[in-house]
């Protein structure tokens, strides 16, 4: 047994161009929190079960509001370590997923909205009891700096936390055949004899005579892989002529479920249905009641008032599993169209649409003239976040369906009278004025104040103004 510890040092824009926009704003203040998921990395099937080594959620960080115009700085972080306890041996090789989540604190319907800002993953070799290991991971334009270590919980010691130490019985030395427990030189390694034949690579024991398996291995001596690929080499385990025709053991072969649990294959893993009084990935944990809080992610625990009665977790939307430990990212298939931002609010999916788009899935293009008819010969003009019709003479309104009164705007100047006409309007000018809109005064001497005529035409030439 032991604890994996993760310390986040910073989360902010990575080096190089294209710095990300701050995830928070004055209108939408937010705070960050982190989730770490650990899986044993003993085989290609490290994803054999979700977060099989454990998972942890950090506290929420301080509320952050972006300063207008400022680039996104390193964002304020939650206090403290993320700690993932592990009950069995430390596998030595592990894979991790660290997620940075944003909690928006604006006026959200139905409570705060969570969205995933960044997810980094990796596979590392790490001995328990060693120093802090430092790491930098990038996700898009973001950069995460962190340290991690695995430490054993007493009395366990060693690189896998499988050796047990006991205080010395005599002050000077350990008993026959027993070594001092480094680094606890004042303690001795406990005499521990595992079941005969127990695999030294994949098995261990905490009590004499037992053989407990590391993640990914099963069988009485921990020699059977829980699930392997059906082909050990490109041609597989069968003859070179027939190719790979023998499916390997499935995840339920050898029944990894303890205490009478029944195993069923899931799309990528297995699931144990546990008898009353047991729970856990392999039904290995007993005597759990609702008082122990076995339901994660806000799941509601029902029943299980005493250790002999089963409890049931009723999971909130977006989570599943017997303990509501599996998160379902319903945004994964990008349900928001046209570049809309998907928010999984738990109780519902919400799309935040880009400018110019609307609808529950941002499916409506507000600028789109396609399929929007402008009546009576009008033409559709895109722009301004909404389509608009430029109407033919004599028509008006949003879709050019209304007959326009061409004289309504009083277009005839200087007291001219307006007459509506099928082709537009006609102005009858008051004495002393002329032009299509009666805009030009006629001088008493017969000369007009019209613009200069082109060469070859005299001002007042009747051809010019017919």
């Amino acid at each position: 047994a032991g604890v994996f510890e993760l310390q986040i040092h910073s989360f902010g824009p990575g080096p190089g161009p294209g710095a990300p926009r701050s995830p928070c704003s004055a209108r939408l203040p937010c705070r960050l929190f982190f989730r770490v998921c650990l899986k044993p990395g003993l085989s290609e099937e490290a994803a054999e079960s979700p977060c099989a080594l454990g998972a942890a959620l950090s506290a929420r960080g301080p509320v952050y509001t972006e300063q207008p115009g400022a680039p996104a700085p390193d964002l304020p972080l939650p206090d403290g370590l993320l700690q993932v306890p592990f009950r069995d041996a430390w596998p030595g090789t592990f894979s991790f997923i660290i997620e940075t989540w944003r909690e928006e604190l604006g006026d959200q319907i139905g409570g705060p909205a969570w969205s995933l800002l960044a997810r980094v993953a990796g596979r590392r070799r790490l001995a328990a009891g060693g120093p802090w290991a430092r790491d930098i991971q990038r996700a898009g334009a973001w950069e995460l700096r962190f340290s991690y270590r695995a430490r054993c919980e007493p009395p366990a010691v060693g690189t896998a936390c499988t050796r047990l130490c006991r205080p010395r019985s005599a002050p000077s030395r350990c008993g026959p055949g027993l070594r001092p427990c480094a680094p606890l030189e004042d303690e001795c390694e406990a005499p521990l004899v595992c079941r005969a034949g127990c695999s030294p690579e994949h098995g261990f024991c905490e009590q004499p005579g037992e053989c407990r398996c590391l993640e990914g291995w099963t069988g009485p001596l921990c020699t059977v892989p829980v699930s392997t690929s059906s082909c050990l080499s490109p041609r597989g385990p069968s003859s070179a002529t027939t190719g790979c025709l023998v499916p390997g053991p499935g995840p339920c072969d050898g029944n990894p479920c303890a205490n009478g649990g029944s195993c069923s294959e899931t799309p990528r893993s297995f699931e144990c249905t546990c008898p009353r009084g047991f729970y856990g990935l392999r039904c290995e944990v007993s005597g759990v009641t609702c008082a122990d809080g076995p339901c994660f992610n806000g799941g509601l625990c029902v029943g299980g008032a005493d250790p002999d009665s089963a409890y049931i977790c009723h999971c909130p939307p977006g989570f599943q599993g017997s303990n509501c430990e599996k998160r379902v990212d319903r945004c994964s298939l990008q349900p928001c169209r046209n570049g809309g931002l998907c928010l999984d609010l738990g109780h519902a999916l919400r799309c935040r649409c880009r400018a110019g788009f609307a609808g529950p899935r941002c499916e409506h293009d507000l600028d789109d003239c396609a399929g929007r008819a402008c009546a009576n010969g009008g033409t559709c003009v895109e722009g301004g976040g909404a389509h608009r019709c430029s109407c033919a003479l004599g028509f008006g309104g949003r879709d050019c369906r209304e007959r326009a009164d061409p004289c309504a705007a009083r277009p005839c100047a200087h007291g001219g009278r307006c007459y509506a006409h099928f082709s537009g309007l006609v102005c009858a000018c008051a004495p002393g004025y002329m032009g299509a809109r009666c805009e030009f005064p006629v001088h008493p001497d017969g000369a007009s104040a019209l613009p200069a005529a082109p060469p070859g035409l005299r001002p007042g030439d009747p051809q010019r103004y017919l």
């Epitope: 290609e44 099937e45 490290a46 994803a47 079960s49 979700p50 977060c51 699930s227 690929s229 059906s230 499916p247 390997g248 069923s264 294959e265 899931t266 799309p267 990528r268 893993s269 699931e271 599943q320 599996k326 998160r327 379902v328 990212d329 319903r330 994964s332 298939l333």
Partner: antibody, heavy 124, light 106 residues
Framework: QITLKESGPTLVKPTQTLTLTCTFS??????????VGWIRQPPGKALEWLAH???????RYSPSLKSRLTITKDTSKNQVVLTMTNMDPVDTATYYC????????????????WGQGTLVTVSS | DIQMTQSPSSLSASVGDRVTITCSAS?????MYWYQQKPGKAPKLLIY???NLASGVPSRFSGSGSGTDFTLTISSLQPEDFATYYC?????????FGQGTKLEIK
């Protein structure tokens, strides 16, 4: 644009082995979260899931057909191969391959793109 | 094995009708998936994770339900909606489909 296409023999004799290939484009089986599955449909009947394979070589087989099925992938060729031994006339069906997506450990998001299918007849 | 039972097996309806197809699982499943299939064509994903519309699927389709009982609803039938509809679960192996519901023009 994502496409999948099934290929293989249209006529197979009883007891023979059927080998079907699914060639796909627009996604890669080296990408985390991606899988390819096989589904069949006898004439006039319902769909039946047969097997699937994930990017990390995790495989699942229908328990009733497990002893006869093998699924493999060739990531570099963008191909998934399904082998079915000891064919019988009741195996006459249209065989489809489809992309499967899982972004959440053990939760399938969707089986969202399908090939057009290939009709395999088992007859002597 | 989890059995999926669709009802009705077939139904006749008219353009503009509101239609509901149900899928009942023999034991609890977390999510339901719905597909539409037209004669001679491959199935097409309609709904994933119980209630999410697949890309390009009109908003007249919707999905709901939890546990063992799930529903596919078409709010106003269009001529192109006449097809066979299948439900499917991904809870445990085998990942079975329903027997199908054939939607015909009245």
């Amino acid at each position: 644009q994502i496409t999948l296409k099934e290929s293989g023999p249209t006529l197979v004799k009883p007891t023979q082995t059927l080998t079907l290939t699914c060639t796909f484009s627009g996604f890669s089986l080296s990408t985390s979260g991606m899988g390819v599955g096989w589904i069949r449909q006898p004439p006039g009947k319902a769909l039946e899931w047969l097997a699937h394979i994930w990017w990390d070589d995790v495989k699942r087989y229908s328990p009733s057909l497990k002893s006869r099925l093998t699924i493999t992938k060739d990531t570099s060729k963008n191909q998934v191969v399904l082998t079915m031994t000891n064919m019988d006339p009741v195996d006459t069906a249209t065989y489809y391959c489809a992309r499967i997506v899982s972004f959440d450990n053990d939760v399938v998001s969707a089986m969202d793109y399908w090939g057009q299918g290939t009709l395999v007849t088992v007859s002597s | 094995d989890i059995q999926m039972t669709q009802s009705p097996s077939s139904l006749s309806a008219s353009v503009g009708d509101r239609v509901t197809i149900t899928c009942s699982a023999s034991s609890s499943v977390s999510y339901m998936y719905w597909y539409q299939q037209k004669p001679g064509k491959a199935p097409k994903l309609l709904i994933y994770l119980t209630s999410n519309l697949a890309s390009g699927v009109p908003s007249r389709f919707s999905g709901s339900g939890s546990g063992t009982d799930f529903t596919l609803t078409i709010s106003s039938l269009q001529p192109e909606d006449f097809a066979t509809y299948y439900c499917q679960h991904w809870r445990s192996n085998p990942f079975t489909f329903g027997q199908g519901t054939k939607l015909e023009i009245k």
